[in-house]
């Protein structure tokens, strides 16, 4: 499919000008060759009207230029003088015409309207409101006023003053007759139709002696406004339509087939679900403006989206509309991330943010989207060391792997963590990538003790039990701070005896933490990785409390939850040792399914080409 | 104690550049994001500008863009707004705050989402543009 979007229709009328504006990715190469606007011919072929080289057709000569903005990715055709001649089809493109990196382009241009002499005419948007004005003499003060559309050769009654509107109005006009000082009646016609366009006449009094007077309502159906963006990337729609209808909901929807409009989202409170997790509808403004985020951008995103108000929200003929057409560009220099990562109660996730890599240091951020709330986003954690208070000790941000992705490592899951979470930068490329954490049935794979306590001045080893699922991978134990978690030394002890059906390829690992001191309180993860790709994490909290008098000595875990054993050694050296065989109660069977991608894997995997990217979780 | 002292303002023309300060104690200065709100006689606050913990992150109201600058030392726990091309709407009296919880709106933009003025806050340096 071709990179290159623009206008799929222009109309135009005889005499007047038309602006074209055609994208194009903005790749050095594309910057830089050849732009041009061609008429495709009966036969194919497409004849060069005006390029960026500097040709322009005898036909164009002194009314048409090209214009090229390399830096927004656009060139845009202005032609001028136009006549029926100009209508037909075209071709804007960039390189050789006939290489099909080209956009077509249908140009409509009609006869100006055949307007009585002293016609009025009123231009008005589709949605919107029209006051006809209709002066009148002070003999025909008294008399009955009316407001007729000409229908064919017809001229039909629209309103007049004795009460009648035609059905075809009925709730949506009103005929105003001014003080006695003015001479004037006015027609206000509100949520205006395509179908109300027409010529009208006004008339005060019935005989030979009325007032009489012409006017042409020509209702605009909005033009689209062009939007090019990024697969994966995200569209902001500005939707502002007028302070009139600032208390009425609104919508934003996505034209189908025909004239259906199915709604995406509305102030209603509905959703599609296509768009659940990847949308917001920013609260109004008093004016009655609002904007809508859509991210994570797929192909089928694209096409054309109406914002509008009604009672409803949703389209209804008169409602008063923006529009916009969706170019969705799938040479996207935004790298595929997982839109779904699962993780099981008390496991973890690790969750790989793109950004954009020319801004490398920029600060990363990453917050809980809260869809009821109108779409705020809190923080929970950023690239500069803060850290949301109640996620101290489970959630950290690393700038790993780099070159345009970054990685965030949420454990301890409870089922209120499932949600959509934003991956954000501050720098100048907007990318707001998407993420939905799903809380799925299972175990989590690494089995440390819980909460531990160490005792000042002596020696404390902390298990992590591997299952051989992660053989292959490199195994840690580090200190969680508010920048990250400091790798600590660790020694691999051997095959773990912690699984019930697994190889000599499971391992505990521990960390041993000699001569404890006060600065050793604080949280420790245990986790897998290869490379620069984190998976699964287990987190340990230590505390650390004085000797106990010689004697008295505690040497019950203290508060340890998976209630492993503790042996004091005579040296002054503490073990924690899970008795996992001996109570199998303990640790859930390790159930390996075969078509579960782990955590680690699915961290570094690369995903699928579906809408729904996922990233696999624990065992389920 | 928490505590947040404000100084720097004063009278200036239109045009003109102050330079607000806001010395922070008795609280970990360099693990808050910070930022300026203001109040116009008569008028509720308004949010100015925040910054980040490491100062990296700069937001700040359109009425201000490209002319107030936000920055801290954390040194110093010292918080500034540096106020040039003043105008006589930049009239109020300007409040330093730390934000429990920094949020983001719906097109990647600091959010202020409000605060109590008992929650920490100073007594507010006033700031008059005249002529």
């Known amino acids: 499919k071709s990179p290159i979007f623009g206008p799929e229709e222009v109309n135009s009328v005889e005499g007047n000008s038309v602006s074209i504006t055609c994208y194009y990715p903005p790749t050095s190469v594309n910057r830089h060759t050849r732009k041009y606007w061609c008429r495709q011919g009966a036969r194919g072929g497409c004849i060069t009207l005006i390029s960026s080289e500097g040709y322009v057709s005898s036909k164009y000569a002194g009314r048409a230029n090209l214009t090229n903005f390399p830096e927004n990715g656009t060139f845009v055709v202005n032609i001028a003088q136009l006549s029926q001649d100009d209508s037909g089809r075209y071709k804007c493109g960039l390189g050789i015409n006939s290489r099909g990196l080209s956009f077509d382009v249908s140009l409509e241009v009609s006869q100006g309207p055949g307007l009585l002499n002293d016609t009025k005419v009123y231009t008005v948007d589709l949605g919107r409101t029209v006051t006809i004005n209709c002066p009148f003499k002070t003999e025909n003060a008294q008399k009955r006023k009316s407001l007729y559309k000409q229908i064919g050769l017809y001229p039909v009654l629209v309103i007049d003053s004795s009460g009648y509107v035609n059905p075809n109005y009925t709730g949506r006009i009103r005929l105003d007759i001014q003080g006695t000082g003015q001479l004037l009646f006015s027609v206000v016609i509100n949520q205006l139709r395509l179908s109300d366009a027409g010529q009208y006449l006004c008339q005060a009094g019935d005989d030979s002696n009325s007032n009489k007077k012409n006017a042409d309502l020509q209702v605009l159906k909005p033009e689209p406004e062009l939007v090019y963006e990024d697969l994966r990337g995200s569209v902001t729609f500005h939707c502002a339509l007028g302070p009139e209808v600032a208390n009425v909901a609104k919508f934003l929807c996505r034209q189908s087939s025909g004239e259906n409009c199915d709604v995406v989202v509305n102030t209603l409170g509905k959703r599609a679900p296509a768009f659940e997790g990847r949308i917001l509808l920013n609260p109004q403004d008093k004016d009655g403006s609002f904007s809508v985020v859509i991210t994570g951008l797929r192909k089928e995103d694209a096409g054309r989206y109406l914002c509008g108000a009604h009672s409803d929200g949703q389209l209804q003929e008169g409602s008063p509309i923006q529009a916009w057409q969706l170019f969705v560009n799938e040479e996207s220099t935004i790298p595929r991330s997982p839109t779904v990562v699962k993780g099981v109660a008390g496991g973890s996730v690790a969750v790989l943010c793109p950004y954009n890599r020319k801004e490398s240091k920029s600060i990363k951020y990453w917050c809980l989207w809260e869809g009821a709330q109108n779409g705020r986003c809190p923080l929970l954690v950023d690239s500069e060391g803060w850290v949301k208070a109640q996620y101290e000790g489970r959630l950290s941000l690393l700038e790993e792997p780099g070159n345009g992705t970054f990685t965030v490592i949420l454990n301890q899951l409870t089922s209120r963590d499932a949600g959509f979470y934003w991956c954000l930068t501050n720098g100048d490329t907007l990318w707001r990538t998407t993420v939905e954490i799903k809380i799925i049935e299972g175990e989590p794979n690494l089995k440390v003790p819980g909460n531990v306590t160490a005792v000042l001045g002596e020696t404390l080893k902390v298990p992590c039990h591997f299952p051989c699922k992660f053989s292959s991978y490199e195994k840690y134990w580090c200190k969680w701070n508010n920048t990250g978690c400091q790798a600590l030394p660790s020694q691999d002890e051997g095959p773990s005896k912690a699984f019930v059906n697994c190889d000599e390829n499971s391992r505990l690992v521990s960390l041993t933490l000699n001569l404890v001191t006060r600065a050793d309180e604080g949280w420790y993860w245990c986790g897998v990785k290869q490379g620069h790709f984190y998976g699964e994490t287990a987190a340990v909290y230590v505390a650390v409390e004085e000797r106990k008098a010689a004697g008295s000595r505690d040497v019950s875990l203290a508060k340890a939850d998976a209630a492993p054993d503790e042996k004091v050694l005579d040296s002054g050296f503490r073990e924690i040792e899970n008795k996992a065989i001996q109570d199998p109660r303990l640790f859930a069977e390790e159930k390996a399914v075969a078509d579960t991608r782990d955590q680690a894997d699915g961290s570094r995997a690369s995903v699928d080409s579906g809408s729904s990217e996922e990233q696999g979780g624990s065992s389920r | 104690e928490v505590q947040l002292v404000e100084s720097g303002g004063g009278l200036a023309q239109p045009g003109g550049s102050l330079r607000l300060s806001c010395a922070a104690s008795?609280?970990?200065?360099?693990?808050?994001?910070m930022y300026w709100v203001r109040q116009a006689p008569g008028k509720g606050l308004e949010w100015v500008s925040a910054?980040?913990?490491?100062?990296?992150?700069?937001y700040y109201a359109d009425s201000v863009k490209g002319r107030f600058t936000i920055s801290r030392d954390n040194a110093k726990n010292t918080l500034y707004l540096q106020m040039n091309s003043l105008k006589p709407e930049d009239t109020a009296r300007y409040y330093c705050a730390r934000d429990e919880a920094p949020t983001f709106d719906y097109s990647g933009n600091y959010a202020y989402t409000g605060s109590d003025p008992n929650d920490y806050w100073g007594q507010g340096t006033q700031v008059t543009v005249s002529s």
């Open positions: 008795g609280f970990a200065f360099s693990s808050y994001w």
């Open positions: 910054i980040s913990t490491g100062g990296g992150g700069t």
